[in-house]
């Protein structure tokens, strides 16, 4: 890995706890200021593998609300607007980091947690299993 | 929002700093133990809107490595394996939280940052702009 010289102005940390517990500033810096938020907002409807978005809320998690995609069809939408079962709609999943309150109900103490979320759907050629 | 009763066993926090700076345990709890990691590993090639995955590395960020998708084509792949320009391959993007070292190069002090990543691609009907 890359070795980074330590900044002498860093907060103190005791080696016995490092790097288990760190200080995190929750004032979010948003790097996405240049992007058009409407750009991909209608892809869920225009896709050949359309999906619905479902609200997943958990007050013990930060962020507390995550939107999850569920593919509408087993197949994909063809040029005629019908479901084509020669193809499959499948969810594109991604592992993301969230903060889990630990101990529970604590406002200022968290643990990092990795969760798998479905972001949208894509249309794939099915894997054909041939019988011997 | 939902009011959560505070756990009396929580670490102390001074109200003047709450909820700006919190303690986070970096020992990641992985909730994805039941998922098959290979399940969607080949969607990028089997999709009608195939994509390539590119490594985005930043030692000042946690996680330092993020994989980003780029659609291979302007159009989508049809049943004959050719690019169909009646459709568009578009990236499915998601805002995710990462930890940014702040001050820079500090091992135990971070700030939450929101970044936009492309997770995969989906095939959509293009928006047709008609000329008046």
């Amino acid at each position: 890995g890359i070795t980074i010289p330590r900044n002498p102005g860093c907060p103190n940390s005791e080696d016995k706890n490092f790097p288990r517990t760190v200080m995190v500033n929750l004032n979010i810096h948003n790097r996405n200021t240049n992007t058009n938020p409407k750009r991909s907002s209608d892809y869920y409807n225009r896709s050949t593998s359309p999906w619905n978005l479902h609200r997943n809320e958990d007050p013990e998690r930060y962020p507390s609300v995550i939107w999850e995609a569920k593919c509408r069809h087993l197949g994909c939408i063809n040029a005629d607007g019908n479901v084509d079962y020669h193809m499959n709609s499948v969810p594109i999943q991604q592992e993301i980091l969230v903060l889990r309150r630990e101990p529970p109900h604590c406002p200022n103490s968290f643990r990092l947690e990795k969760i798998l979320v479905s972001v949208g759907c894509t249309c794939v050629t099915p894997i054909v299993h041939h019988v011997a | 929002g939902i009011t959560i009763p505070r756990n009396p066993g929580c670490p102390n926090s001074e109200d003047k700093n709450f909820p700006r700076t919190v303690m986070v345990n970096l020992n990641i709890h992985n909730r994805n133990t039941n998922t098959n990691p290979k399940r969607s590993s080949d969607y990028y090639n089997r999709s009608t809107s195939p994509w390539n995955l590119h490594r985005n590395e930043d030692p000042e960020r946690y996680p330092s490595v993020i994989w980003e998708a780029k659609c291979r084509h302007l159009g989508c792949i049809n049943a004959d394996g050719n690019v169909d320009y009646h459709m568009n391959s578009v990236p499915i993007q998601q805002e995710i939280l990462v930890l940014r070292r702040e001050p820079p190069h500090c091992p135990n002090s971070f700030r939450l940052e929101k970044i936009l990543v492309s997770v995969g691609c989906t095939c959509v009907t293009p928006i047709v702009h008609h000329v008046a």
Partner: antibody
């Protein structure tokens, strides 16, 4: 070898029409989308239009939409650009260019082969 | 509509490295191609899909793309590299191909 040769350029009056041709050789023409790109004298490259391999899908830059028509005849390995209602700002060298995609969609290479270009001058 | 921005000119000495920059909103999410054009000639593809080099293009040409910036790097620049270089990407929102304004490279 792979080659694209444009023809049909010349001088035309504002409001007039012109048809450009591009003859392709050395590759399977209908496997690839094709483009027209233009370059005004002393200026940069400007994309004009795209047509899919089967000719069924076409797209245009806003600057030519409604005035230009891209077409192809795969039996003749030829690409065309019908230019109507020509304006002085359409004066440029017009290039045809191939958009390569392999048969299983593993790679995509826009404008991998270019023609030598043909000059259109719109002037009264 | 989407735009790509390039500096109009860049000068380097022979043997030096030339970094030709192309900027666009969130450009890292798109593939960028680069084209070399010498006066009176047709453009020539030198880099596609950010980093890939067509056969026949010298290894001193390389590409990268991160953040809002794509870079064409010519290491050990030679006098014959003196040309105008254009970056290009596609825009799915308008189904169009977008060229940068071009950078004229002078090898002094």
């Amino acid at each position: 070898q792979v080659q694209l040769v444009e023809s049909g350029g010349g001088v035309v009056q504002p409001g007039g029409s012109l048809r450009l041709s591009c003859a392709a050789s050395g590759f399977t023409f209908d496997d690839h989308a094709m483009h027209w790109v233009r370059q005004a004298p002393g200026k940069g490259l400007e994309w004009v239009s795209l047509i899919s391999g089967d000719g069924g899908a076409t797209y245009y830059a806003d600057s030519v939409k409604g005035r230009f028509i891209i077409s192809r005849d795969n039996s003749k390995n030829s690409l065309y650009l019908q230019m109507n209602s020509l304006r002085a700002e359409d004066t440029a060298v017009y290039y045809c260019a191939r958009h390569f995609s392999d048969s299983r969609g593993r790679s995509d290479v826009p404008f991998d082969i270019w023609g030598q270009g043909t000059l259109i001058t719109v002037s009264s | 509509s989407y735009e790509l921005t390039q500096a109009p000119s860049l000068s380097v000495s022979p043997g030096q490295t030339a970094n030709i920059i192309c900027s666009g909103d969130n450009l890292r999410t798109k593939y960028v191609s680069w084209y070399q054009q010498k006066p009176g000639q047709s453009p020539l593809l030198v880099i596609y899909q950010d980093t890939r080099r067509p056969s026949g293009i010298p290894a001193r040409f390389s590409g990268s793309n991160s953040g809002n910036t794509a870079t064409l790097t010519i290491s050990g620049t030679q006098t014959r590299d003196e040309s105008t270089y254009y970056c290009m990407t596609w825009d799915v929102d308008t189904t169009s191909m977008i060229f940068g304004g071009g950078t004229k490279l002078t090898v002094l």
